[in-house]
Amino acid sequence: AQNITARIGEPLVLKCKGAPKKPPQRLEWKLNTGRTEAWKVLSPQGGGPWDSVARVLPNGSLFLPAVGIQDEGIFRCQAMNRNGKETKSNYRVRVYQIPGKPEIVDSASELTAGVPNKVGTCVSEGSYPAGTLSWHLDGKPLVPNEKGVSVKEQTRRHPETGLFTLQSELMVTPARGGDPRPTFSCSFSPGLPRHRALRTAPIQPRVWEPVPLEEVQLVVEPEGGAVAPGGTVTLTCEVPAQPSPQIHWMKDGVPLPLPPSPVLILPEIGPQDQGTYSCVATHSSHGPQESRAVSISIIEPGEEGPTAGSVGGSGLGTLALA
């Protein structure tokens, strides 16, 4: 069978080979399409409801004024010339519709390096057959499930027109130190060959590089955190971040009911002050970050104090942002 590709809504003429150019003609067309249950026979006499869909022209060709999805299928013509020689024509008709230019919607203006980000959603409406959407970074195709790239796809079919709407959501994890202004685009590739891809306008989000948090330092005076009864201990929380975060204090894992301050003074130390202390710096952009823990202890006269405070666990570390 000869393959014929026709655009939806356009007229289509199929030649009946070997048919006399004008009546009288001995020919018949047989159709097996989405409109027929089995084979439908059409003759030059025509007439009836089929004339609006397909009719035989005076020269024996079959004319479809506006091809639709239901016209996909097999078309056969059997003709006999004046000498009684029989000729058969066989066509396989496929239809297509090129959608409008695809678009990127819900596009991100900023991405964060090192974490997955939604870049945007590519939408193509009105294609047949469905076709495919693919994403590009600086003109080169992005491959899902490679190098921090993931794609969520959805295909819907219009209940009346039968045309397809495709959606593709792109997630990427930009590398640290990469291009600060990557250029993303999306393209629609038709399901039928010989038609070039349609590409969206590009988008160019900024990539924000989160500054790695420097550690919160807890300095103890006297060094080691061991002090005689009635002595004074000064705990200082040093945070290099700007602007200065709020500093709260913890004792034995419980927040102390004190106003925020980078310095905690424990005057006239008594047994009740012994324990493990840490400070928590709360950044507006990064969330809370806890220092190492230090142990404050009382030494009786004549005892050797430890040269350094015993260090507890690493605390909360940096809490991930939701």
């Epitope: 080169k140 491959v143 070039r196 306008a201 590009p202």
Partner: antibody, heavy 118, light 113 residues
């Protein structure tokens, strides 16, 4: 047929600015990138950057950031390149070219000669 | 930046001869995901603009005579003119569009003996 028509030659003084135009015809201006390329005698070809007229997104060669500014006017299907703080190093022929990700720089303007001299 | 090197810088041939010119890149121009080489060849005739001859390293632009052929992959590329004509007198440039900034080779000047 596709055509890119560039503005005429420019003679400018050091320190001044110049704006070169590139008028597109024969295709949908907003669907293709316009790239700009510099050619100095004996220095070969240097890529300056691109603009996508559909949404006026740009990409520059780091070397030309601050030197070249790319703009586009959809209504007249014209792309522009402004060159600022000109020195003798900027004396060159500047080309605009239509670019398609699938076909590279498939159509070029005829070039605009810029001479920087006091 | 990707450095593009062309050789020879010039060559003189007689009409009808076969010509090959080389273009090497400092890093691969082959993108593994689609197995395409992001390399183009351009022709610049004296006093004229540039004309695209080849893209994807080996695909001939429509309207370009079939005596022009591009080949190669990765970092080594070749432009071949199977039978030179007098009108082929020009400078031929290769260009990578694999990564920013896009870069061009220094050109090969073809002269006719």
């Amino acid at each position: 047929q596709v055509q890119l028509q560039q503005s005429g030659p420019e003679l400018v003084k050091p320190g001044a600015s110049v704006r070169i135009s590139c008028k597109a015809s024969g295709y949908t201006f907003t669907d293709y990138y316009i790239h700009w390329v510099k050619q100095r005698p004996g220095q070969g070809l240097e890529w300056i950057g691109w603009i996508y007229p559909g949404n006026v997104i740009t990409k520059y060669n780091e070397k030309f950031k601050g030197k070249a500014t790319l703009t586009a006017d959809k209504s007249s299907s014209t792309a522009y390149m402004q060159l600022s703080s000109l020195t003798s190093e900027d004396s060159a022929v500047y080309f605009c070219a239509r670019y398609d990700y699938d076909y590279a720089m498939d159509y070029w303007g005829q070039g605009t000669s810029v001479t920087v001299s006091s | 930046d990707i450095v593009m090197s062309q050789s020879p810088s010039s060559l003189a041939v007689s009409v009808g001869e076969k010509v090959t010119m080389s273009c090497k890149s400092s890093q691969t121009l082959l993108y593994s995901s689609n197995q395409k080489n992001y390399l183009a060849w351009y022709q610049q005739k004296p006093g004229q603009s540039l004309k695209l001859l080849i893209y994807w390293a080996s695909t001939r632009e429509s309207g370009v005579p079939d005596r022009f052929a591009g080949s190669g992959s990765g970092t080594d590329f070749t432009l071949t003119i199977s039978s030179v004509k007098a009108e082929d007198l020009a400078v031929y440039y290769c260009q990578q569009y694999f990564g920013y900034p896009y870069t061009f080779g220094g050109g090969t000047k073809l002269e006719i003996k």
